[in-house]
């Protein structure tokens, strides 16, 4: 804001002069600028207890420029408005008010919510998530071998985070139990403890291909359990498929 304060040089008639400094078109000793040169805005500037006229190239915060033929001035925005385009269109509200369509409101209208960061009334945004990604491989303790039952996981992304009043996001992670075809761990696939452990020789009646039940890997000590015969294993496989459960974790 460029301010110009007038100083009288040539007496036109009582208290008015046209030989002013800066942006003043007419001025007086007592009042400063009375009117401004074209395109400048008249404003009152408080100096101590006194207000004097100044001419500005743009209006200060809380004011907007009004232009009439050959007479422009800075006009106050409404009481609840900090910056405005004109009397009826606010662009930033004072503290405690929310901006909506150029107006400052105590509360936002139905269907809108207050954004306390921008101090605006905004549309309520509901959560949006992507389609599920494919299920991960069936694993147990990070391994895909050496067990029969494990868990598999799938995830989806949050495309749109919800606003304060929006619907919460559904779970983005889903875990379920799974079964795998018996598969011996190749050399180097088993965990350190598994490699260090001296395996017992199979008892009579046990299948050499049989792998430990999932429970046998759940214990960190990996205590071997009794092996199942082939008939029992088939029976268990059917039961496991029926029992397959989905566990969700909310993010």
């Amino acid at each position: 804001q460029n301010a110009s304060r007038g100083r009288r040089q040539r007496r036109m008639h009582p208290n008015v002069s046209q030989g002013c400094q800066g942006g003043c078109a007419t001025c007086s000793d007592y009042n400063g600028c009375l009117s401004c040169k074209p395109r400048l805005f008249f404003a009152l500037e408080r100096i101590g207890m006194k207000q004097i006229g100044v001419c500005l190239s743009s209006c200060p915060s809380g004011y907007y420029g009004t232009r009439y033929p050959d007479i422009n001035k800075c006009t106050k925005c409404k009481a609840d408005c900090d910056t405005c385009f004109n009397k009826n269109f606010c662009t930033k509200c004072k503290s405690g008010f929310y901006l909506h369509l150029g107006k400052c409101l105590d509360n936002c209208p139905e269907g809108l919510e207050a954004n306390n960061h921008t101090m605006e009334c905004v549309s309520i945004v509901h959560c949006e998530v992507s389609e599920w990604n494919p299920w991960s491989p069936c694993t147990k303790k990070g391994k895909t071998c050496g067990f029969k039952r494990g868990t598999e996981t799938r995830v989806r992304e949050i495309i749109q985070h919800p606003s304060a009043k929006g619907n919460l996001c559904p779970p983005t992670n889903e875990t379920r139990k799974c079964t795998v075809q018996r598969k011996k761990c190749q050399k180097g696939e088993r965990g350190k403890k598994g490699r260090e452990r001296k395996r017992k020789k199979p008892n009579k009646g046990e299948s050499k291909e049989a792998i430990p039940d999932s429970k046998s890997l759940e214990s960190s000590k990996e205590i071997p359990e009794q092996r199942e015969n082939k008939q029992q294993q088939k029976k268990r496989k059917v039961q496991d498929k029926q029992k397959s459960v989905s566990v969700s974790t909310v993010h």
Epitope: M12, H13, N15, V16, Q18, A25, T26, C27, S28, N31, G32, C33, L34, S35, C36, F42, L44, Q51, I52, G53, T66, Y68, P69, D70, I71, K73, T75, K76, K78, A79, K87
Partner: antibody, heavy 119, light 107 residues
Framework: EVQLVESGPGLVKPSETLSLTCTVS????????WNWIRQPPGKGLEWIGY???????YQNPSLKSRVTISRDTSKNQFSLKLSSVTAADTAVYYC?????????????WGQGTLVTVSS | DIQMTQSPSSLSASVGDRVTITCKAS??????LSWFQQKPGKAPKTLIY???RLVDGVPSRFSGSGSGTDYTLTISSLQPEDFATYYC?????????FGQGTKVEIK
């Protein structure tokens, strides 16, 4: 001292055009803002419009379609024309001036002229 | 347009009385307010501008105050020559509008 004097017919017929002139002395109409104001008998004041130092005009929107303000700088005069008058336009018409927002608004007035609209 | 509501519309007072006239604007007029005195058959005379600035030659018993939407003209000690009609005028924006007037009569 700035002086303003209104002149024009005191009687105008309905539907005709009221024409008044304000002659200024003590200052040039090429500085300041030159206004017309009226006052119906026994009532309050109503601002009609102004002509600026450069000859630009602004009228009260309530009268705009009927008002024309013009000037003659060679005679240091400005004029008011109000068309399609009715009895409601009967009033004392004043010319007055101001020099900007920072000084007295309407520091100088003419003595006023009564215009009666009647057939 | 900004409306100016002046009160009272008339009042009766005696010489020496303190008289207060108020003007209420329909919106904040940011101190752009003048007061005029008008006597019968005469043109109005400007007393005060920018809310509280006295025009040269106007007696100091006249004073103005106010801000926002509410403004007051005070005559501290009414004199015989003060019996007249008083008008407020806002000039915060165009069109300019006057109050309806307050007639100060002798009691």
């Amino acid at each position: 001292e700035v002086q303003l004097v209104e002149s024009g017919p005191g009687l105008v017929k309905p539907s005709e055009t009221l024409s008044l002139t304000c002659t200024v002395s003590g200052d040039s109409i090429t500085s300041g803002y030159w206004n017309w104001i009226r006052q119906p008998p026994g009532k309050g004041l109503e601002w009609i419009g102004y002509i600026s130092y450069s000859g630009k005009t602004y009228q009260n929107p309530s009268l705009k379609s009927r008002v024309t303000i013009s000037r003659d700088t060679s005679k240091n005069q400005f004029s008011l024309k109000l068309s399609s008058v009715t009895a409601a336009d009967t009033a004392v018409y004043y010319c007055a001036t101001y020099y900007g927002y920072g000084g007295p608004f309407f520091a100088y007035w003419g003595q006023g002229t009564l215009v009666t609209v009647s057939s | 347009d900004i409306q100016m509501t002046q009160s009272p519309s008339s009042l009766s007072a005696s010489v020496g009385d303190r008289v207060t006239i108020t003007c209420k604007a329909s919106q904040d007029i940011d101190s752009y307010l003048s007061w005029f005195q008008q006597k019968p058959g005469k043109a109005p005379k400007t007393l005060i501008y920018l809310t509280n600035r006295l025009v040269d030659g106007v007696p100091s018993r006249f004073s103005g105050s106010g801000s926002g939407t509410d403004y007051t003209l005070t005559i501290s000690s009414l004199q015989p020559e003060d019996f007249a009609t008083y008008y407020c005028l806002h000039y915060d924006e165009f069109p300019l509008t006057f109050g309806q007037g307050t007639k100060v009569e002798i009691k």
